[in-house]
């Protein structure tokens, strides 16, 4: 640690005195102190000498000697008082800037330590301090206002009693800045804008911050707009608002608008897009396929996206048949607004019944006209199977009817023994019918197919099974001969249309 000569913590001299402060260290040393006049600084070997031959009250202050090469950063200090009977204060700053809740040091340095008992802090023109101002005094450093508040941003003077009268320092301006958490908060309204050419429009860009020192501007396609700014202060925040009013919009007004605000912490920006159109529009679309297939008993949500300007004047879901004249329950229709010009309309169809297959149409209307979007809903069914024994052209024939959607495939199995269902171990023969005859195939209905298996002689201890399957499931019917003439019915007696 460097050593200062004279080796006293403080030195009191009269104006005009010669002061010599010597600092000695192991290596090179350097002096520092407040910016003040009349000092001469010179080196003498390993020491540094700070001297003046004409000390003034302005030389009052703490002078520190450091050893730059010392990794521990050791230093020594001496405080110099130049006691001027006419000047009790040496003020080291015109202005002090701190953040809220920091201690604010007002550097009024007392030039004579004897005066310490009679010092006080006042506001300029003799006004008292604000209530709850908590402060302390150090003759070396000045007055400290503890945990300064924004409201304490004032001009202060230091007062000392000299010969029974108060002598004031020059004033110090205290600026207490709000602690700024980040760039100003921004809003740009609306988030999106559409207008028909000739209509009026308004875009509002506003920014707010706890501190008044911030800038805000609105730009259109990277061109800064000259808009008068409205300023306000409420909820302890400063607000600056820019309002762009357009009486009759045209295509050149369209494009990207950005609201930008900045302060010492950085910059925030937010953007919106303004579309100018020739006339009203109404567009319906869906992310779903308009042709839907759902298994019976399951649920389906039909979703339509609507883009429209001006807003919708009416909309509804309609069931167009073919099964009944029922209409979707309103409680199953749901509308959500994605933003001002885009909406999603959902029709919920839970636990679908056979009578609910068919066409569903969403209709919407605005000044641009009517639009409709129609979904076709076909229900999927697992196959239902039945088998009868009959004679066709004199030949004994097993006739299998399978009904389902999508169209079922048919497979015949012959197996030993009497069983409800042939298993692999019992199977004697398998016949696939690649082209069963389609008996009925109407939109939104089940498809019914028929497959014939000609059997010369029915084996009594055997089972004949017709199996049908599609993407939903499978069904089967096992035919067990009881006697040679068992189950002989005309084919048209078992055919049915669901």
């Amino acid at each position: 640690i460097p050593v200062i000569e004279p080796s006293v913590p403080e030195l009191v001299v009269k104006p005009g005195a010669t002061v010599t402060l010597r600092c000695v260290g192991n290596g090179s040393v350097e002096w520092d102190g407040p910016p003040s006049p009349h000092w001469t600084l010179y080196s003498d070997g390993s020491s540094s000498i700070l001297s003046t031959n004409n000390a003034t009250f302005q030389n009052t202050g703490t002078y520190r000697c450091t050893e730059p090469g010392d990794p521990l950063g050791g230093s020594a200090a001496i405080h110099l008082y130049v006691k001027d009977p006419a000047r009790p204060w040496n003020v080291l700053a015109q202005e002090v800037v701190v953040f809220e809740d920091q201690d604010a040091l007002l550097p009024c340095l007392l030039t004579d330590p004897v005066l310490e008992a009679g010092v006080s802090l006042v506001r300029v023109r003799g006004r008292p301090l604000m209530r709850h101002t908590n402060y302390s005094f150090s003759p070396w450093h000045g007055f400290t206002i503890h945990r300064a508040k924004f409201i304490q941003s004032q001009d202060y003077q230091c007062s000392a009693l000299m010969g029974g009268r108060k002598v004031m320092s020059i004033s110090i301006r205290l600026k207490v800045q709000k602690v700024i958490p980040g760039p100003p908060a921004l809003t740009l309204v609306p988030a999106e804008l559409v207008r028909i050419r000739g209509e009026a429009a308004q875009i509002v860009c506003s920014a707010s911050s706890v501190d008044v020192n911030f800038d805000v501007f609105l730009q259109h396609n990277n061109t800064k707009l000259a808009i008068p700014q409205q300023s306000d202060f409420h909820n302890n925040r400063y607000q600056k608002v820019l309002t762009l009013n357009l009486d009759q919009v045209d295509f050149q007004h369209a494009g990207n608008y950005s609201c930008v605000a900045s302060n010492v912490q950085g910059k925030h920006s937010t953007s919106m897009f303004f579309r100018v159109v020739e006339s009203a529009y109404l567009n319906l679309s869906s992310e779903q396929n308009l042709i839907q297939e759902v298994t019976v008993g399951e649920g389906l949500n039909l979703k339509v996206m609507v883009e429209a300007y001006p807003g919708l004047q009416g909309f509804n879901w309609t069931y167009l048949g073919p099964f009944s004249d029922h209409q979707p329950e309103p409680k199953l229709a749901n509308a959500t607004t994605k933003d001002t010009y885009r909406h999603t309309f959902t029709l919920s169809l839970p636990r679908l019944k056979p009578s609910e297959a068919g066409r569903y149409s969403f209709l919407a209307r605005n000044p641009g006209g009517w639009r409709a979007l129609t979904f076709e809903l076909t229900l999927r069914y697992p196959p239902e199977v039945s088998v009868i024994w009959t004679f066709i052209n004199g030949s004994g024939t097993l006739l299998c009817a399978a009904s389902g959607y999508p169209q079922p495939n048919v497979t015949w199995l012959q197996c030993s023994g009497h069983t409800d269902r042939c298993d692999e171990a019992q199977v004697l023969q398998v016949w696939d019918d690649p082209y069963p005859e389609v008996l009925s195939q109407e939109p939104f209905h089940k498809v019914t197919v028929q497959s014939l298996l000609t059997v010369e002689t029915l084996e009594h201890n055997q089972t004949y099974e017709c199996r049908a399957h599609n993407s939903v499931g499978s069904g089967s019917w096992a035919f067990i001969p009881i006697s040679a003439g068992a189950h002989t019915h005309p084919p048209d007696e078992f055919l049915f249309t669901p």
Epitope: W31, P34, P35, H38, L41, L50, A93, V96, L105
Partner: antibody
Framework: QVQLQESGPGLVKPSETLSLTCTVS????????WIWIRQPPGKGLEWIGY???????NYNPSLKSRVTISVGTSKNQFSLKLSSVTAADTAVYYC???????????WGQGTLVTVSS | QSVLTQPPSASGTPGQRVTISCSGS????????VNWYQQLPGTAPKLLIY???QRPSGVPDRFSGSKSGTSASLAISGLQSEDEADYYC???????????FGGGTKLTVL
């Protein structure tokens, strides 16, 4: 070794506020006084103001009404704000360490700020 | 207009000695010490002389300063091409309560 680095926008529009930050490394700003100095193109040096870490500042009387020097947003930084700028404020702005008033022993490399619309 | 007055230019040939003057008043040079700064092209100023005649470590002894009354001067002996730079004087000013600078002298090594 103490090093100083100025940062901030190189272009400011007339009537707006010029904002610069000086970052000190290799030493602490909590001792010594620090200073902002500027140099218009092809001209001499001009003192703007002093700063001490406690928040104390002294300004050149010719700029006093427009200038604020304060502690920066992060440790070991101090900042300069000059409001209502005109083309006459176009200059290279330097921050430096000050000892005993006019001994400026460490300087930043300087940053050119142009005031233009 | 700078508070301290310096000649705008000076020149010399390599090896020569050149002197740059700086003139002030009683409120600055008359009552306070003078510091000199060297500014090489495209760089920041660098402390060259402090307290009238003190050289920081690393500054060659070819550079010397002096002060008399309200004037100061910087002398460079054994001029070298790398000395081509702008030189500024500075001092504390009591009436301004801050530092003042000279307008700078451009030194050309011929």
């Amino acid at each position: 070794q103490v090093q100083l680095q100025e940062s901030g926008p190189g272009l400011v529009k007339p009537s707006e506020t010029l904002s610069l930050t000086c970052t000190v490394s290799g030493g602490s700003i909590s001792s010594y006084y620090w200073i902002w100095i500027r140099q218009p193109p092809g001209k001499g040096l001009e003192w703007i103001g002093y700063f001490y870490y406690s928040g104390s500042t002294n300004y050149n009387p010719s700029l006093k009404s427009r200038v604020t020097i304060s502690v920066g947003t992060s440790k070991n930084q101090f900042s300069l704000k000059l409001s209502s700028v005109t083309a006459a404020d176009t200059a290279v702005y330097y921050c430096a360490r000050s000892r005993l008033g006019s001994i400026f022993d460490y300087w930043g490399q300087g940053t050119l700020v142009t005031v233009s619309s | 207009q700078s508070v301290l007055t310096q000649p705008p230019s000076a020149s010399g040939t390599p090896g020569q000695r050149v002197t740059i003057s700086c003139s002030g008043s009683s409120s600055n040079i008359g009552s306070n010490t003078v510091n000199w700064y060297q500014q090489l092209p495209g760089t920041a100023p660098k402390l060259l002389i402090y307290s009238n005649n003190q050289r920081p470590s690393g500054v060659p002894d070819r550079f010397s300063g002096s002060k008399s009354g309200t004037s100061a001067s910087l002398a460079i002996s054994g001029l070298q091409s790398e000395d081509e730079a702008d030189y500024y004087c500075a001092a504390w000013d009591d009436s301004l309560n801050g530092p003042v600078f000279g307008g700078g002298t451009k030194l050309t090594v011929l």
